[in-house]
């Protein structure tokens, strides 16, 4: 006899990276017929939802209207059908961004390179942080972590055309509180064949559409959040 129900899915809309004072919704999807959902934050009960009518609802939303450092951290959810509880969901790391300062991102030898060249990104922030994060914009939200007193190096090694795209970096004050994003740096990698078009599976965006990027990233998740690439989430743990 089954003692627990399958774990629900948890995700954040529009994104798990939330600028301070902006809104975010944590979604928890369980099963139709669930009579109660519980959202837990850092191991403590955060909120409860009892859907009405339960047989017509399989997803609930927990709204955070004003993101701040107190709301940043690890969330999970569970649901109940009758007296039977589910396994807990995976952990959702909710990150508050736009804290304190803005780092500077640079690339060596430059933003336009030939396939096979060694490329290194440098993220610099003069305030009190020793952890840095480099993100490549696009659906899979690739994140690299680096360390340094005021600057971190991110060696990409010999690059291929797959490295083409727009990069930003953050200073991290703790796992869940990040700085403002740096200005974007667009890396252009020219292959043997003269073709400088961007890889279609990894779209990039102009400097003023970081918010659009976040929404676009999450759109892929909404289509099938079970298959979403959790690279960025796992890196936080």
């Amino acid at each position: 006899q089954q003692q627990t129900l399958p774990k629900p899915f948890i995700w954040a809309e529009p994104h798990f990276m939330v600028p301070k004072e902006k809104q975010v919704t944590i979604c928890c999807q369980g099963n139709y017929g669930a009579v109660e959902y519980q959202l837990h934050f850092e191991g403590s009960l955060f909120a409860v939802d009892r859907p009405k009518p339960p047989e017509r609802i399989n997803k609930v939303q927990f709204y955070i209207p004003d993101m701040n450092s107190r709301m940043a951290g690890q969330y999970s959810c569970i649901y109940r059908v009758g007296e039977l509880w589910s396994e807990p969901s995976n952990l959702l790391d909710l990150v508050v961004t736009e804290m304190y300062d803005t780092p500077t991102l640079s690339v060596h030898p430059g933003p336009e390179v030939i396939s096979g060249e060694k490329v290194t990104f440098y993220c610099r922030l003069d305030t009190a942080t020793s952890m840095f994060l480099l993100l490549k914009e696009g659906r899979s939200s690739h994140v690299q972590r680096g360390y340094g007193k005021v600057q971190a190096e991110f060696p990409l090694g010999p690059v291929t055309t797959a490295h083409r795209g727009t990069y930003r970096c953050f200073g991290s004050y703790n796992n869940h509180a990040w700085s403002f994003p740096s200005e974007p740096v667009k890396l252009l990698v020219t292959g043997d064949i003269e073709n400088t078009s961007l890889a279609p599976e990894d779209p990039t965006f102009p400097a003023d559409t970081w918010g659009t990027y976040l929404l676009t990233t999450e759109t892929g998740l909404q289509k099938d959040h079970a298959l979403w690439d959790h690279t960025a989430q796992n890196l936080l743990r």
Epitope: F46, A47, V48, D49, F62, Y63
Partner: nanobody
Framework: QVQLVESGGGLVQAGGSLRLSCAAS????????MGWFRQAPGKEREFVAA????????HYADSAKGRFIISRDNAKNTVSLQVNSVNLEDTAVYYC????????????????????WGQGTQVTVSS
């Protein structure tokens, strides 16, 4: 913006009952989950009870189950907490709080999830 003002506190004898009220200003009261918290001398603020924006869903701390009843009147912008069989451990400052929710059936439990707080009303239980 929501302003919250608690009332109904004071001195009460052990074994008696009291009713705390919280008046909210603003036209969006019916969109907020409302909660009661309390803070005893030398202790952290603790959750007591909460009610969803629709009033259909309530949630109580284990220590509050059975003796406490939370209710709301969206027409009057008020939320109340009835406390029965009060005991010395109920001595505390009681706070009303409001949390904006996406769904009418959500109650917020964690203090971090509340956007607005009242100034509190003191309840003192005498033996």
């Amino acid at each position: 913006q929501v302003q919250l003002v608690e009332s109904g506190g004071g001195l009460v004898q052990a074994g008696g009952s009291l009713r705390l009220s919280c008046a909210a200003s603003g036209r969006t009261f019916s969109r907020y989950s409302m909660g009661w918290f309390r803070q005893a001398p030398g202790k952290e603020r603790e959750f007591v009870a909460a009610i969803s924006s629709s009033g259909d869903v309530t949630h109580y701390a284990d220590s509050a189950k059975g003796r406490f009843i939370i209710s709301r009147d969206n027409a009057k912008n008020t939320v109340s907490l009835q406390v029965n069989s009060v005991n010395l451990e109920d001595t505390a400052v009681y706070y009303c709080a409001a949390s904006l929710t996406a769904r009418a059936t959500t109650v917020t439990v964690h203090p971090n999830g509340y956007n607005y707080w009242g100034q509190g009303t003191q309840v003192t239980v005498s033996s």
